[in-house]
Amino acid sequence: LHCPAACTCSNNIVDCRGKGLTEIPTNLPETITEIRLEQNTIKVIPPGAFSPYKKLRRIDLSNNQISELAPDAFQGLRSLNSLVLYGNKITELPKSLFEGLFSLQLLLLNANKINCLRVDAFQDLHNLNLLSLYDNKLQTIAKGTFSPLRAIQTMHLAQNPFICDCHLKWLADYLHTNPIETSGARCTSPRRLANKRIGQIKSKKFRCS
């Protein structure tokens, strides 16, 4: 077990920021509580990449080139508080990716290319306080996707090409009841609703032809 040559390791924090890494370092001390991997050129998060590190509380993978995430990449990380994945090339979240992350409070997925969300994507995230999906490719979100998020306080959904039809009516109702969307998510289509804030549109206007 060692500290990667380019990185610094102290107080159970592994700091590999901007070190030109192309893959997740392996054989790290099992006691680490935080790993900072932002601003590298990592493309793939392989199976069980972080599983040996059961004490991890924060993972920062922002501003890499991640396009592929193994479904069990974060398996078993019951102490994880923050997962920072913004500024990558993620197009989808594999089934069970966040399974068992009961302690997660912050999930930052902004500035990716996510085009759809499984309805059970956030199934175990009962303690999530902030979810950022800002600046992705989401056109719709299935009803019930946010139901498990009992502790959610802030959600960022802006800069997504939302189609405001009958399938998104539930989201307008949800945001009326829970005014937690602070980034100003807007409709892209149909034209009559384009650029209007989803949380401010009357639900009867969400129609399917």
Partner: antibody, heavy 118, light 107 residues
Framework: QVQLVQSGAEVKQPGSSVKVSCKAS????????VSWVRQAPGQGLEWMGG????????NYAQKFQGRVTITADESTDTVYMDLSSLKSENTAVYYC???????????WGQGTLVTVSS | DIQMTQSPSSLSASIGDRVTITCRAS??????LNWYQQKPGKAPKFLIY???NLQSGVPSRFSGSGSGTDFTLTISSLQPEDFAIYYC?????????FGGGTTVEIK
Amino acid sequence: QVQLVQSGAEVKQPGSSVKVSCKASGGSFRSYTVSWVRQAPGQGLEWMGGIIPIFGTANYAQKFQGRVTITADESTDTVYMDLSSLKSENTAVYYCATGSGWYTFDYWGQGTLVTVSS
Amino acid sequence: DIQMTQSPSSLSASIGDRVTITCRASQNINSYLNWYQQKPGKAPKFLIYAASNLQSGVPSRFSGSGSGTDFTLTISSLQPEDFAIYYCQQSYRSPPTFGGGTTVEIK
């Protein structure tokens, strides 16, 4: 690891406002949560609110809503706490703190004593 | 808001003593309980997270236990540098709230 360095002590008149700064050294905290916690003389700890610098939107305790404003300047890795309409009971040490989640405070600034007195 | 109640509010102990501080939450907070140590004129220091996990660099004589509403901080053998105020804090729901503190004094 991130170290937090706060601005110096302040003496303020009742009714005025105070702006306390908290600067990160030894690493950026742009995607960390930064909270403000206050401690009146001889009293316990009280969370005021927090912010994630990359988003800029803050989260406040109900008690301080409308009177406290927390902002961040990403370019200088500095977070600010502005408290208005000061009263003598706002005399306290104000700490900034950061951690792995919204409500866990791993690292603390050294504290800034704000004295409100006429 | 979730209320956190610590007991005792103060205690006197001798070097080498086993010291136990309890913290009770007004509702179930699972294991979302942190402990801090504060010395006069200093910022609090993070000791234990998630009820029982020692923060890096904290001596192993400190331990935490509990879940739900009842939690305990134990110092197995009190050292001179342990005389301080100890606070519990819930990180389960907003706003995070602290206990009133327990002062550990020299007997």
